[in-house]
């Protein structure tokens, strides 16, 4: 058993049929010695008396808010949560496996630049009685500070018969060094509590590996005289790190016909313009990627050819 | 470059960008199912990293690029020695057209651009890393290539910025 926060405790249980459970001793936080009784949740049934209560925790029915009283007055509370371990593996019932970029990806994180700011998000089908708490650091043995805000519900989607809820959190490294080569990864830890179930999820990454620039901005077409060709131009997204002579991007320009089956013409360039042939009913799209490190491409910015 | 002269920024920019391309073709991370099995532990704590105080940021380069260039040179020599060591030359053998050979040559080429014959910056000793099992050697190769990708990305940014703002 360990303390998650004041008066909230997590009991770690091996979860299998007829498992013996864990013996837990609760102590009433009071100078009083006599006349103390214990109850669980809203029930008035007295579970025991005395300054300490010993219970065998085996299942969710044994978890909850234990309260010690004296003469009708509440002395203190202890909330017991359960953390299940099945076949040697901690349960992951609360969050959905996003399976990208690999299996067992419950937390996904992205950064728009090298400033040390990043966003993480996760999915769940649970709509109520759900709380999250996020902590982060750079490195684990001698951790350096990363400050995370509160997790918020950022999107709701309908998937078949189920509703899916997306939560996200923004974090900022306290002393970020955008130009340095990272040697210690960022660690993100999310505590999830649903009713009386506790779970924790972690992710470890280098900012360089989660970079995904915003799409290029101000995408414009300029027809070239007496030609089917057009000059496409664009600019670096506002959110990308500066100076651009140092934090450079590379770009992919794509001409795509109306039909998905039509052949796509692609050009790769380090410049912020390119000359392409604009076909009727086609569209031109441009996306960006770090020029020197193969992290994610941005989403496409698009304009119609006509 | 030792003694404060300016490097051939444009040449260094071109060669460092080529290094980036080669490092990624030697270990294309994207979508490889074995990545999660590489483990999170560092390849080696002795790999030289370009750190915050090494003056490789735009302001540091403007003030005095020598500190940063020396750091990059140390790293290039370190990785050049690693790629030439029995970690890469022993079994399992690489295919003749492996990008590792070109990568090794390009590391040497860029380090010579930074330090012409007759000049000497102190270099870092390479640790004796070679594991006994072939699979351990193979895994170590991929981990070295991953850290090299990060190193050459920073070096390429430095030379691109230098070529754009510090070239005579």
């Amino acid at each position: 058993i360990w303390e998650l926060k004041k008066d909230v405790y997590v009991v770690e249980l091996d979860w299998y049929p007829d498992a013996p459970g864990e013996m837990v001793v609760l102590t009433c936080d009071t100078p009083e010695e006599d006349g103390i009784t214990w109850t669980l949740d809203q029930s008035s049934e007295v579970l025991g008396s005395g300054k300490t209560l010993t219970i065998q925790v085996k299942e969710f029915g044994d978890a909850g808010q234990y309260t010690c009283h004296k003469g009708g007055e509440v002395l203190s509370h202890s909330l017991l949560l359960l953390h299940k371990k099945e076949d040697g593996i901690w349960s992951t019932d609360i969050l959905k496996d996003q399976k990208e970029p690999k299996n067992k990806t419950f937390l996904r994180c992205e950064a728009k630049n090298y400033s040390g700011r990043f966003t993480c998000w996760w999915l769940t089908t649970i709509s109520t009685d759900l709380t999250f708490s996020v902590k982060s650091s750079r490195g684990s043995s001698d951790p350096q500070g990363v400050t995370c805000g509160a997790a918020t519900l950022s999107a709701e989607r309908v998937r078949g018969d189920n509703k899916e809820y997306e939560y996200s959190v923004e974090c900022q490294e306290d002393s970020a060094c955008p130009a340095a080569e990272e040697s210690l990864p960022i660690e993100v830890m999310v505590d999830a509590v649903h009713k009386l179930k506790y779970e924790n999820y972690t992710s470890s990454f280098f900012i360089r590996d989660i970079i995904k620039p915003d799409p290029p901005k101000n995408l414009q077409l300029k027809p070239l005289k007496n030609s089917r060709q057009v000059e496409v131009s664009w600019e670096y997204p506002d959110t990308w790190s500066t100076p651009h002579s140092y934090f450079s991007l590379t770009f992919c320009v794509q001409v795509q016909g109306k039909s998905k089956r039509e052949k796509k013409d692609r050009v790769f360039t380090d410049k912020t313009s390119a000359t392409v042939i604009c076909r009727k009913n086609a569209s031109i799209s441009v996306r960006a990627q770090d020029r020197y490190y193969s992290s994610s491409w941005s989403e496409w910015a698009s304009v119609p050819c006509s | 470059v030792p003694g404060g002269s300016s490097p051939a920024w444009t040449q260094c920019q071109q060669l460092s960008q080529k290094l980036c391309t080669l490092a990624w073709s030697a270990h294309p991370l994207v979508g490889h199912m074995d990545l999660r099995e590489e483990g999170d532990e560092e390849t080696t704590n002795d790999v030289p990293h370009i750190q915050c105080g090494d003056g490789c940021d735009p302001q540091g380069l403007r003030d005095n690029s020598q500190f940063c260039l020396q750091r990059i040179h140390q790293g290039l020599i370190f990785y050049e020695k690693l790629l030439g060591s029995d970690i890469f030359t022993g079994e399992p053998s690489l295919l003749p057209d492996s990008p590792v050979g070109q990568l090794h040559a390009s590391l040497l080429g860029l380090s010579q651009l930074l330090q012409p014959e007759g000049h000497h910056w102190e270099t870092q000793q390479i640790p004796s890393l070679s594991p006994s099992q072939p699979w351990q050697r193979l895994l170590l190769r991929f981990k070295i290539l991953r850290s090299l990708q990060a190193f050459v990305a920073v070096a390429a940014r430095v030379f691109a910025h230098g070529a754009a703002t510090l070239s005579p």
Epitope: D87, G88, I89, N103, K104 | S25, A26, H27, P28, M33, D34, R36, E37, E38, G39, P92, S93, L94, L95, D97, S98, P99, V100, Q133, P134, W135, Q136, L138, L139, F142
Partner: antibody, heavy 118, light 111 residues
Framework: QVQLQQSDAELVKPGASVKISCKVS????????IHWMKQRPEQGLEWIGY????????KFNEKFKGKATLTADKSSSTAYMQLNSLTSEDSAVYFC???????????WGQGTSVAVSS | DIVLTQSPASLAVSLGQRATISCRAS??????????IHWYQQKPGQPPKFLIY???NLDSGVPARFSGSGSGTDFTLNIHPVEEEDAATYYC?????????FGGGTKLEIK
């Protein structure tokens, strides 16, 4: 030295399920994936799938999805494969093997024979 | 899925002669300087025994009369000079992507 010790032969009825074990020793269980193969009499080898004991997550050959369940118990350094809804087509010898990253299956279990018969 | 086609299905070789087994992949299994093809030997009633990894590298303890070669889609296992104890079925296997697949096997008989 590295060893993979599989459980004994099984004779099971059609429609039943069977759970085969593969106990490893001589290396850190969580370091390498454990793969499972099927071999029918006088036939070649088929790859069923693997489990990575460090995260407990399996990957399957599409053909065996729903047929095989892969688990790993870190405390006993044992990998398990459960085969469900058995038919005569599942009668075979099943092998477990370890695979270091980027490498081959370098150590194999001795095999477990499963016979499905009424 | 990558299909591995082994040929011949069986062959008989005189003691001391060369045995050559071919393994052809339906698409390239080479990338980043390596060919992700491995070879195994299996004798009746036994599990497969690991012989060669990444197309051409011998596992420790495997006799030097075994050798592997090839890249891209065409691979070869050679045994020279063949000995009595080499009578077995030989399988190639790829680990380029999921799902892994094995070749159909080549049964080697010693004359």
């Amino acid at each position: 030295q590295v060893q993979l010790q599989q459980s004994d032969a099984e004779l099971v009825k059609p429609g039943a399920s069977v759970k085969i074990s593969c106990k490893v020793s001589g290396y850190t269980f969580t370091d390498h994936t454990i793969h499972w193969m099927k071999q029918r009499p006088e036939q070649g080898l088929e790859w069923i799938g693997y489990i990575y004991p460090r995260d407990g997550y399996p990957k399957f050959n599409e053909k065996f999805k729903g047929k095989a369940t892969l688990t790993a118990d870190k405390s006993s350094s044992t990998a398990y494969m459960q085969l469900n809804s058995l038919t005569s087509e599942d009668s075979a010898v099943y092998f477990c093997a370890r695979r270091p990253p980027y490498y081959a299956m370098d150590y194999w279990g001795q095999g477990t024979s499963v016979a499905v018969s009424s | 899925d990558i299909v591995l086609t082994q040929s011949p299905a069986s062959l008989a070789v005189s003691l001391g002669q060369r045995a050559t087994i071919s393994c052809r992949a339906s698409k390239s299994v080479s990338t980043s300087g390596y060919s992700y093809i491995h070879w195994y030997q299996q004798k009746p009633g036994q599990p497969p025994k690991f012989l060669i990894y990444l197309a051409s590298n011998l596992d420790s303890g495997v006799p030097a009369r075994f050798s592997g070669s090839g890249s891209g889609t065409d691979f070869t296992l050679n045994i020279h000079p063949v000995e009595e104890e080499d009578a077995a079925t030989y399988y190639c296997q790829h680990s380029r992507e999921l799902p892994y697949t094995f070749g159909g096997g080549t049964k080697l008989e010693i004359k």
